[in-house]
Interface confidence: low
């Protein structure tokens, strides 16, 4: 099938980085500056994405692949292919229509993005609160009160909280 197709359609021989130029007897012409074709057989090249303003270039455009953008410091990507940049907030805050607001009591956010989430309710699992929650950190649940009776083994200390800036995105 591929051989038949290439015999019928000379454009199928044009590799990525070129386009099939109808104005020049369908020869394969390289994509002009600031454009690309990521697959073979294309009749036009696509214009390279421009990473402007709050976007910055993560990977420059080449003749075969589009530019990739990320966000300038203080912002993070949202959407497929980083289609939007959203303002960062501090840990312990969430972004609202009026800007960054501190998490309400009983909620936390350990990242620079996303919303404040309620502290874990330790009692639902029959456990007690070992370390109180803050705006930036969830509570740490410990053994149930019954487990802390005299003679019970000591509690393993909780793992250290993640360092700011190293929370998963």
């Amino acid at each position: 099938f591929e051989r038949t197709r290439s015999l019928q359609d000379p454009c199928s021989n044009c590799p990525a980085g070129t386009f099939c130029d109808n104005n020049r007897n369908q020869i394969c012409s390289p994509c002009p500056p600031n454009s690309f074709s990521s697959a073979g057989g294309q009749r036009t090249c696509d214009i390279c994405r421009q990473c402007k303003g709050v976007f910055r270039t993560r990977k420059e455009c080449s003749s075969t692949s589009n530019a990739e953008c990320d966000c300038t410091p203080g912002f993070h990507c949202l959407g497929a292919g980083c289609s939007m940049c959203e303002q960062d907030c501090k840990q312990g805050q969430e972004l609202t229509k009026k800007g960054c607001k501190d998490c309400c009591f009983g909620t936390f956010n350990d990242q620079k993005r996303g919303i404040c989430r309620p502290w874990t309710n330790c009692s639902l699992d029959g456990k007690s609160v070992l370390v109180n929650g803050t705006k930036e950190r969830d509570v740490v649940c410990g053994p149930s009160p019954a487990d802390l009776s005299p003679g019970a083994s000591s509690v393993t200390p909780p793992a250290p909280a993640r360092e700011p800036g190293h929370s998963p995105q």
Epitope: P15, A16, G17, C28, P33, N34, C48, C51, E60, C61
Partner: antibody, heavy 117, light 107 residues
Framework: EVQLQQSGTVLARPGASVKMSCKAS????????MHWVKQRPGQGLEWIGV????????SYNQKFKGKAKLTAVTSASTAYMELSSLTNEDSAVYYC??????????WGQGTTLTVSS | NIVMTQSPKSMSMSVGERVTLSCKAS??????VSWYQQKPEQSPKLLIY???NRYTGVPDRFTGSGSATDFTLTISSVQPEDLADYHC?????????FGSGTKLEIK
Amino acid sequence: EVQLQQSGTVLARPGASVKMSCKASGYSFTSNWMHWVKQRPGQGLEWIGVIYPGNSDTSYNQKFKGKAKLTAVTSASTAYMELSSLTNEDSAVYYCTRGITTAPEYWGQGTTLTVSS
Amino acid sequence: NIVMTQSPKSMSMSVGERVTLSCKASENVGIYVSWYQQKPEQSPKLLIYGASNRYTGVPDRFTGSGSATDFTLTISSVQPEDLADYHCGHTYNYPFTFGSGTKLEIK
């Protein structure tokens, strides 16, 4: 690592022709533009033209049409520029430079051409 | 052809000073302007492409800005190793053209 290795210094007589080379390594030679740029002593840069080695498509600065001819041998990953009917005005350093679509990126070390009788 | 005009032709600055180089295009070239640094007896090196994108490995004291016809290269705190010629050029269409360069000298 991308490298562009250009041929050495050339001394030529007025009216003669010269052909300089630019050997590429470290990337796909056939799918990247190769530009040629002229720089006369103490002056700015002048874009001569560009070749796409994948199909030898070229585009020239009108000023250099008939003066420069760009070719490429893909099996040797080498681009060539031939300059004809040389005059003193052609005395310069000539650079080959690989282009990303938004800028000439990697530059060769340059070939110095001196035209003198 | 699009004409790229650089100013000043040359400048002499002290270490630590802020340097601003200008490049004007004779017509709208969008963001398709690049800046190159050329040290004595060396090939040009790409500093900035797409008007404001710092090329890999370029120190962050170099910043490009502008669009359409007016472009600027700023060196926030000039260092002795910044002694060089600086060229701007457009890649908006063929033929690419360059400015005549700005020579930066260090006092």
